[in-house]
Structure formats: C-alpha cells, structure tokens
C-alpha cells in the first residue's frame, strides 16, 4: 500500500453567485484526517492520532493553506459561465502517492454537481476528460481559466504535485503514521433469525492498515461468497479500520463454524460463542 | 510448495496404541485445519476427524469417538493422530489432509501404513 | 450420515473414449460441498475438482463436473493414459464428512 494524501475541496455557488463558505476534506492513508469548516477555516485533526502528527504548532500552516486554496477554487468556480439557477457545487479533489519504491503519483480531478468533468496528471500535467459534451464544454471553460493567468498556473497548480509530496513526507516523518501495524479486536456475536437458525456475525475493529480477510470457514473451509455477507471496510475515527462478516447456520452447528481472520501476515481463529456474546483480542 | 509429510509405517499388536505424526510446511501451520483419513487395503476412504490448530477444537466422526484422540504441538508445528485399543481392522493407510480454502480436502500426506498384526 | 454411491463400481474404457462417472446421495447436498478425488495406486488421494464444478489448481479441463441435489457428475471428455485411477466423490455439507466408495476407471 503507497502513502497518500487526499485533499478534497467543495464550493458552493447559488443562482450564480459563488458562496464564501467551503469545504475541506484530507486524508492521510485513506483515513480521515483534517477538516475545513465552512465559514470559519480551522483545520481540525479528527482523532488523537491526527493531532499527534501534526501538533498544535503546524495548524496554522494547514488552515493558511487550506484557505488559499478554498479560495482559488472559488474564484474557478465563478468563471464557470452559463450556471443555472439553484445550488450547484465545485469540488476539486488532488491526491498524491509516495509508493515503496519511492515513486510517486498525483492527480487532480474536478467534478461539478458531483460529475467528474477534467483530470490532470500532475507529474506530466497531461489533462483528461470525458467524452459527454455537458463535461467537455466545463473542462474547457476551467482550463482556459487556468491559463489565463500564466504564473499562477506555473506557480500554483503545477507546483501542487511538489506541495503535496511535501506535505505527505512532512505528515510521514511524525513517525505516527509509519508502516505501522494494529492488529484487530475480534468479537464474534450470535443472534436468533428464523427458527432454527441463528445468524452468526463476526467484527474486526481497531485494526490498520486497512487490508483484512475475514470470513466464515465450516470445518476449516470458507464458505462460498453468497452465503456470507460482508459489511464494508471504514474508519472508525481513530486512525484505524472496521469491518464485519455474518452468516446464518443451523442451530446445533456452531461447533462446526469458525471466523477467520488474516491481517498483516497474521492471523487468528475465532469460535461461534455458546452465550450471546465472545471478545477475543488477538494475541500473536 | 506445501507438504505434509508422515511418520513411517508401524507394526502393532492387537489392543496397543499407535501415533502418526503429520507435519505440514509451506503455510503457516495454525491457519488451516488437519484432518485425518484412513484406508483399510483395497477399500474406500474413511474420515477420522480434524482438529483446528489455532484453537485446539477438535471434531470427531462418531465412529472413532472413543478411539482416537488429535492433537497438535504449535511449537513444532506437528499434527498427531492416537488410536488406541487397536484390532486387525484398523490395519490401513492413515492419511493427514489439510483443509482448503474452497474444500475439506486440498493437499494430503503420503501416508502411514498401520499394521495390526498378533 | 449421507451415504454416497458412486457407479459404476468399475469402468473399462480405452485412451480416448469418455467417461461419465454417477455420485448418488442419500439426501440432497448444497453444490458447495460436493468435492471429487483422485487416486492412483500407492499414491494419495488428490483434490480434482471442488464445489461440484471447479477444477483444482493443475487439473487439466478434460476434466468437469456437474450436477445438484442428490445427483453429481464427474466427466473425463477424453481419456489420456494417466487418468486410469480410482476416483472418489465427497460431501462436506453435514458430518460425518463421508466419501464414495469410489470408481475405478480401467484401461479395456
């Protein structure tokens, strides 16, 4: 898995005037990690542990930087000509990759009222859009801004991919974020469905990076992907990740079921409770 | 390459115990079940049982209930079948198998022939 | 337990020709659960095909398997010389995890 560095910015316009509120969005290593209020910009570090890699001395930088791209993004979003009446939405997302052979990747991608509209490749600044004629006549609108003002774009969109990069080394040299590994909690649950039957639900939480197997075996074999059903993997806020898998068996079966769990080259065998409820923490 | 490689055959008499040993290589040791499977000469395959490493759980087909006893040693990584109270019957080839990912049964020992002989 | 049935008991059949091997069950088996082996004298039995259909990872595709509920199929399209062993249906569906007595398939 490569670190990366997600920002994603929205503004807003009504009946063609742009808002002076804005959004912003950044995640580091897919996970949620600063936000950019509206109104008032303060880069606000979800969870402790994005405030142990920034620390209060760096929020200044972020939220001046933040700022200045929320504004640029609104100054964009005003030269966006022909705007029809009601709410409409700018948003511009740019991502950055440093992978473990120390390559790297970026791009940038515009969506209007949530429709993909212009990408640019920020390393050979190669642009792309889709082939709609609605998307194209936007993509030509934005980057005939982009150009007209020369220096900001030398200066501005194109030193993003080297900003970005920057920024990312800068989050990474904390330490906190690291190659770091958490192993899961598991916590296998039982519960009555149609009578007998018993749906049976195995959870991994607290556990990162975010790549996980979990999966219901019955005597060592997994059983087949339409008899299982898998929640998705998501933050859970504290720079870590959950997830879920259940099935239903035959009451009287349990000792035949097992929850299986692979994370970070180890992994761990979690039984059907007898009771309603077993917490097992990994031990390896 | 994934393995399992058995004890060597054993000669019995009738009432005695026997233990064949079943280590696998090439996976990671607690992460599959072993089963045990066994075949009387010019006969069909007959399940035992299987024990899951990681957890130590074992499952027994009825028939060897009270017979057979599986366990494991995680520090070496080695799989145990005892059967015990032997009679001329279990005279037979004792296969460990490892379980697989989509069925019971994916790679399998080279075997141990038990003999039971007076 | 489910007793399974294979047959014929033994097939004789020349390189070449086909092979339709029958594995009856004594009560219906999800397709998830029904595995097919092979196995050569003084050999291991091999995984050949799983969850009725799938071939096993090095299994030549003359090989397929078919079926559902109580009835399975095991086919070799087209016999080569290494394909006369014995082979051996198996249900995992519910315990006592049970075999076919198997098939013989002998060169004619």
């Known amino acids: 898995e490569p670190h990366s560095l997600r920002y994603n910015l929205t503004v807003l316009s009504w009946d063609g005037s742009v808002q002076s509120g804005f959004l912003t969005e950044v995640h580091l290593d897919g996970q949620p990690f600063l936000r950019c209020d509206r109104q008032k910009c303060r880069a606000k570090p979800q969870g402790q542990w994005a405030e142990d890699v920034l620390g209060n001395k760096t929020w200044d930088r972020e939220t001046r930087d933040l700022t200045g791209n929320g504004k640029d993004l609104r100054m964009t979003l005003a030269h966006i000509k022909d705007q029809k009446e009601g709410l409409h939405s700018l948003q511009e997302i740019r991502v950055c990759e440093i992978h473990e052979d120390n390559s790297t990747r970026s791009s940038q991608h515009f969506y209007y009222d949530g429709e993909l509209f212009l990408s640019q490749n920020l390393e050979t600044k190669e642009w792309t859009m889709p082939q709609s004629s609605r998307a194209q006549t936007l993509a030509m609108n934005v980057r005939n801004f982009l150009k007209e003002d020369a220096m900001k774009t030398k200066t501005h969109y194109h030193a993003m991919h080297a900003d970005c990069l920057q920024e990312l080394r800068r989050y990474l040299k904390s330490g906190v974020v690291l190659r770091r590994t958490v192993p899961p909690m598991v916590n296998v649950t039982r519960s009555e469905a149609s009578e007998g039957n018993i749906t049976v639900t195995c959870r991994a939480s607290g556990f990162y990076p975010w790549n996980i197997t979990l999966s219901w075996r019955q005597d060592g074999v997994s059983l087949s992907h339409d008899t299982q059903q898998w929640g998705d993997v998501l933050p859970d806020g504290n720079g870590t990740y959950q997830t879920w898998v259940a099935t239903r068996i035959c009451q009287g079966e349990e000792q035949r079921f097992t929850c299986y769990m692979e994370h970070s080259g180890n992994h761990s065998t979690h039984p059907v409770p007898s009771g309603k409820v077993l917490v097992l923490q990994s031990h390896w | 390459e994934i393995q399992l490689v058995q004890s060597g055959a054993e000669v019995k008499k009738p009432g005695s115990s026997v233990k064949v040993s079943c280590k696998p290589s090439g996976y990671a040791f607690t992460s599959n079940n072993i089963y045990w499977v066994r075949q009387a000469p010019g006969q069909g395959l007959e399940w035992i049982g299987y024990i899951d490493p990681y957890i130590g759980r074992i499952i027994y087909n009825q028939q060897f209930k009270d017979r057979a006893t599986l366990t494991v040693d995680k520090s070496t990584s080695t799989a145990y079948m005892e059967l015990s109270s032997l009679r001329s019957e279990d005279t037979a080839v004792y296969y460990c198998s490892r379980s697989g990912e989509r069925s019971n049964f994916d790679y399998w020992g080279q075997g141990t022939l038990v003999t039971v002989s007076s | 337990e489910i007793v399974l049935t294979q047959s014929p008991a033994t097939l004789s059949l020349s390189p070449g020709e086909r092979a339709t091997l029958s594995c009856s069950a004594s009560s219906s088996i999800s397709s998830n659960y029904l595995h097919w082996y092979q196995q050569k004298p003084g050999q291991a039995p091999r995984l050949l095909i799983y969850r009725t259909s799938n071939l096993a990872s090095g299994i030549p595709a003359r090989f397929s398997g078919s079926g559902s509920g109580t009835d399975f199929t095991l086919t070799i399209s087209s016999l080569e010389p290494e394909d006369f062993a014995v082979y051996y249906c198996?249900?995992?569906?519910?315990?006592?995890?049970?075999f076919g007595q198997g098939t013989k398939v002998e060169i004619k």
């Open positions: 198996q249900q995992g569906g519910s315990l006592p995890l049970t």
